[in-house]
C-alpha cells in the first residue's frame, strides 16, 4: 500500500549503529549490548566512551557549569572539556567549582605568578622576590 509519512512528532528515532565486538570488547565511541553480541554507538553530544570497553551504557557527557567555558564539546569518544572563566581558577583539592582569583597580594608580598584557569595568583615575600631576581639576572 501507499507509504504514510509520519508527522514530525511521530518520526522514529534514528537507529544507533551496531557492529560486532572484538575479543568481547567494543571500540571507543561504543558500548556493548546486554547479551554481549553487539556494539552500539554512543549518542553524539549526549554520551561517550574513551577506550575499548564492555560498558552496558555509554558515559554521560559533562555539562559545563555557569562560570566555566567549554573548550571542546563532547564527542562519542571524548568528554566535554570545561575550563574556568577568566579571573577564576579550579583547585586540585576542590575541583567541583571555580574560585575567584585574588586581585592582589597581601602587604609585604609581590606577585610572581598570574591567575590562570588552574591556579590563583602567586605571591611571595618581597625579600624572596629580590633573591629570585638576583638569581635569575
Amino acid at each position: 500500500g501507499p507509504s504514510m509519512a509520519l508527522a514530525p512528532q511521530q518520526r522514529a528515532a534514528p537507529q544507533q549503529k551496531r557492529s560486532s565486538p572484538s575479543e568481547g570488547l567494543c571500540p571507543p565511541g561504543h558500548h556493548i549490548s546486554e547479551d554481549g553480541r553487539d556494539c552500539i554507538s554512543c549518542k553524539y553530544g549526549q554520551d561517550y566512551s574513551t577506550h575499548w570497553n564492555d560498558l552496558l551504557f555509554c558515559l554521560r557527557c559533562t555539562r559545563c557549569d555557569s562560570g566555566e567555558v567549554e573548550l571542546s564539546p563532547c564527542t562519542t569518544t571524548r568528554n566535554t572539556v570545561c575550563q574556568c572563566e577568566e579571573g577564576t581558577f579550579r583547585e586540585e583539592d576542590s575541583p567541583e567549582m571555580c574560585r575567584k582569583c585574588r586581585t592582589g597580594c597581601p602587604r609585604g608580598m609581590v606577585k610572581v605568578g598570574d591567575c590562570t584557569p588552574w591556579s590563583d595568583i602567586e605571591c611571595v615575600h618581597k625579600e624572596s622576590a629580590a633573591a629570585l631576581e638576583v638569581l635569575f639576572q
Epitope: 565486538p21 572484538s22 575479543e23 568481547g24 570488547l25 571500540p27 556493548i32 547479551d35 554481549g36 574513551t50 577506550h51 575499548w52 570497553n53 564492555d54 560498558l55 552496558l56 551504557f57 558515559l59
Partner: nanobody, 126 residues
Framework: EVQLLESGGGLVQPGGSLRLSCAAS????????VGWFRQAPGKGREFVSA????????YYADSVKGRFTISRDNSKNTVYLQMNSLRPEDTAVYYC???????????????????WGQGTLVTVSS
Amino acid sequence: EVQLLESGGGLVQPGGSLRLSCAASGRTFGSIRVGWFRQAPGKGREFVSAINRNDGTTYYADSVKGRFTISRDNSKNTVYLQMNSLRPEDTAVYYCAAGLQYNRAADRVPVGAVYWGQGTLVTVSS
C-alpha cells in the same frame, strides 16, 4: 549510579588464604567484565584478575596465576577473589573495578576502569 563494595580483607600469615567479595548495587556492575586491581604502598595500581559475568571467562596477571581464583555469583550480583598461598608481596589495597578500559581489543590487561570500589586492605605478614 554504579556502586561497588569490597569486603574480606585483613591480616593473614604467609601461605594463608583470604576471600575477597565485591558486591554491586545500583545499575549492577555497569559492564560485563568485572575485575580486581591492587595498589601496594608507594606503588601504582596494578591489574590482578577479571571475569566475564556472562560466560565466566577469566583473566589473570602472571604474578597471581595458579594462586588466585576469580569467580562470580550473578544471582547475588557479587564477584569473588579467592587468594591462596599468599606472599608478603601480595600486601596491598585491593580494588574491585568495572567498566574495564583497554587500549586495544586484543589486550589482556586493562589500563584502567570507569567504576571503582573504595578498596579493602590485605596485609600478608608473620
